[in-house]
């Protein structure tokens, strides 16, 4: 978890450009900004949701243009724009900053908004680094801003994926060392025994492999069938072998304004009551005018801070502010063991071998268009066609000559002959059967099973 922070320094006419003031002949106005973050590893459609998060600035000071005066840099809202992110920081991202004008004159139906400028940039940025500055042009306007991504403890690292706690806290989790005092950096963990499970094992000394509760074995790969200690956090207690509860992310309830806290792997999530949002439900007094509904949600009600607003979320999003992406793959749309991929704008299935279709619903006809040579027949199954070859041929497509007797099918010294209709075993005295597998009893009757009528010991036996 962490926060992306954006500081707008100035917004005004760019060099050489003197756009008409956004305020001219329109009465009093004020600016506000909206920021949208998308993971930028692949080009995303312009209309795709702000998957990493979005935020809205406060309103800037009211401004009325002085007639005939040159358009200056415009008065800006105070403070940072902060976009909390719950998962790993992706490193490469798309940053979209919109500058909006709110007209405060006597409008029918309340204030009117219009988009003045929109800048979009794909950027590479490590979490925990210094502020990065940028200047972007949008038409005749120029926007100057700085931004950074920072992790929130216990997350650290360039992607906020490693967990750390101060030294004063209980020992860190598996594979993690305590932080040095006042440092946001994890010490490098020791090198554990080769093969030690990354998920279920950890070590405090090089070469060891200690298991988390519920796992056992030299490499912590074996689940323990029952344990009274599962679900507890913290270091092992030498007396009980159980885990002693350590501080958890929801201890002390970090959610403000009556929000309820639930733990997520390595972090927490606040479910906010209506009228509040933000990582810790700390943002309040929100109306529809503040644009609290993310990801294209439609805001209704909430004309003033005392009346609640409701966000109607588009498909794929939920939460009081449409801030949570629905796990659409949980509906298991992919058949036949296909892997569901949520691409943001749509779901796609990656099919196992032998299946096709948008939901892997079609069996592949493995023999379609694939011939078996030399009289072989194609056998379908499991996405890998197989040739059943005629006698004397082998290989994937029956193109290779094969000695049918090479597998030595005749037992007890029987001699193998390739016959046009199959293999034939000529059995040594005292044996019979298709593969000479049955010893013949001294009285001329074979051991079970009985020989078929008409066969005598020593006769060639046809291999089925």
């Amino acid at each position: 978890a962490g926060v992306f922070e954006l500081q707008i320094h100035s917004f005004g006419p760019g060099p050489g450009g003197a756009p008409r003031s956004p305020y001219s002949a329109r009465g009093p106005c004020r600016l506000f900004f909206r920021v949208c973050l998308k993971p930028g590893l692949s080009e995303e459609a312009a209309e795709s949701p702000c998957a990493l998060g979005a935020a809205l600035s406060a309103r800037g000071p009211v401004y009325t243009e002085q007639p005939e005066a040159p358009a200056p840099d415009l008065p800006l809202p105070n403070g940072l724009l902060q976009v909390p992110f719950r998962d790993a920081w992706p490193g490469t991202f798309s940053l979209i900053i919109e500058t909006w004008r709110e007209e405060l004159g006597d409008q029918i139906g309340g204030p009117a908004w219009s988009l003045l400028a929109r800048v979009t940039r794909r950027r590479r940025l490590a979490a925990g680094g210094p502020w990065a500055g940028d200047i972007q042009r949008a038409g005749a306007w120029e926007l100057r801003f700085s931004y950074r991504a920072r992790c929130e403890l216990p997350a650290v690292g360039t992607a906020c994926t490693r967990l750390c706690r101060p030294r004063s806290a209980s020992r860190c989790g598996p594979g993690l060392r305590p932080c040095a005092p006042l440092e946001d950096e994890c010490e490098a963990p020791p090198v554990c025994r080769a093969g030690c499970s990354l998920e279920h094992g950890f070590c405090e000394q090089p070469g060891e492999c200690r298991c988390l509760e519920g796992w056992t074995g030299p490499l912590c790969m074996v689940p323990v069938s029952t344990s009274s200690c599962l679900g507890l956090r913290g270091p092992s207690s030498t007396t009980t072998g159980c885990l002693v509860p350590g501080p958890g992310p929801c201890d002390g309830n970090p959610c403000a304004n009556g929000g309820s806290c639930s733990e997520t792997p390595g972090s927490f999530e606040c479910t906010c009551p209506r009228g509040f949002y933000g990582l810790r439900c700390e943002v309040s007094g929100v109306t529809c005018a503040d644009g609290p509904c993310f990801n294209g949600g439609l805001c209704v009600g909430g004309a003033d801070p005392d009346s609640a607003y409701i966000c109607h979320c588009p498909p794929g999003f939920q939460g009081s502010n449409c801030e949570k992406r629905v796990d659409r793959c949980s509906l298991q749309p992919c058949r036949n063991g296909g892997l569901c991929l949520d691409l943001g704008h749509a779901l796609r299935c990656r099919c196992r071998a032998g299946f096709a279709g948008p939901r892997c619903e079609h069996d592949l006809n493995d023999c379609a268009g694939r011939a078996c040579a030399n009289g072989g027949t194609c056998v379908e199954g499991g996405g890998a066609h197989r040739c059943s070859c005629a006698l004397g041929f082998g290989g994937r497509d029956c193109r290779e000559r094969a000695d049918p007797c090479a597998a030595r099918p005749c037992a007890h010294g029987g001699r193998c002959y390739a016959h046009f209709s199959g293999l034939v075993c000529a059995c040594a005295p005292g044996y019979m059967g298709a593969r000479c597998e049955f010893p013949v009893h001294p009285d001329g009757v074979s051991a079970l099973p009985a020989a078929p009528p008409g066969l005598r010991p020593g006769d060639p036996q046809r291999y089925p």
Epitope: A346, A356, D363, L364
Partner: antibody, heavy 120, light 106 residues
Framework: EVHLQQSGPVLVKPGPSVKISCKAS????????MHWVKQSHGKSLEWIGL????????SYNQKFKGKATLTVDTSSSTAYMELNSLTSEDSAVYYC?????????????WGQGTSVTVSS | DIVMTQSQKFMSTSVGDRVSISCKAS??????IAWYQQKPGQSPKALIY???YRYSGVPDRFTGSGSGTDFTLTINNVQSEDLAEYFC?????????FGSGTKLEI
Amino acid sequence: EVHLQQSGPVLVKPGPSVKISCKASGFTFTDYYMHWVKQSHGKSLEWIGLVYPYNGDISYNQKFKGKATLTVDTSSSTAYMELNSLTSEDSAVYYCARQGNYVNNAIDYWGQGTSVTVSS
Amino acid sequence: DIVMTQSQKFMSTSVGDRVSISCKASQNVGNIIAWYQQKPGQSPKALIYLASYRYSGVPDRFTGSGSGTDFTLTINNVQSEDLAEYFCQQYSDSPYTFGSGTKLEI
């Protein structure tokens, strides 16, 4: 604009085979499944099978296995269907159609159809 | 195979009326069905996917509904150009199967 242009009507005698084509334009051919559907005179639609130009995967309706053979030529964005051992039962209009490769996608565009008449 | 049943072969209506065409699946297909319109001498045209989502360009008088096994295509304010045969199709399972069609007579 999405367009699926099918080959013209054919009149064939019973016995041999016939191959009909469907040339795709206006979209990325390899991103879509190409389907073939049969419509006998005055009757409903029957799904024959599909081919995925991206990797050549083919799936047939069991009923049409051995009757239809589906192929594609990605260089010309063309799908083909060959019908063999023709009988009067094979007289019908045959449509090619496309379907996207996302979970929600249905068959969305159809060719104009190719009429096949089998008569001695 | 999943059987799609359109019990009414023909339906008669007048311009401006509202008409509902039904389709029943022999087993649960969720909402993985589509509706197609086929005018005389033409190829089918896609109207609805995922039971209730209209393709772009399809007039909003066409509405799809239902899930599981029972589905309906409703045409509000029927127009003369809606004279056609309407087919439902499940694309939940292979082989894809179509209903027998319902001809709308105006």
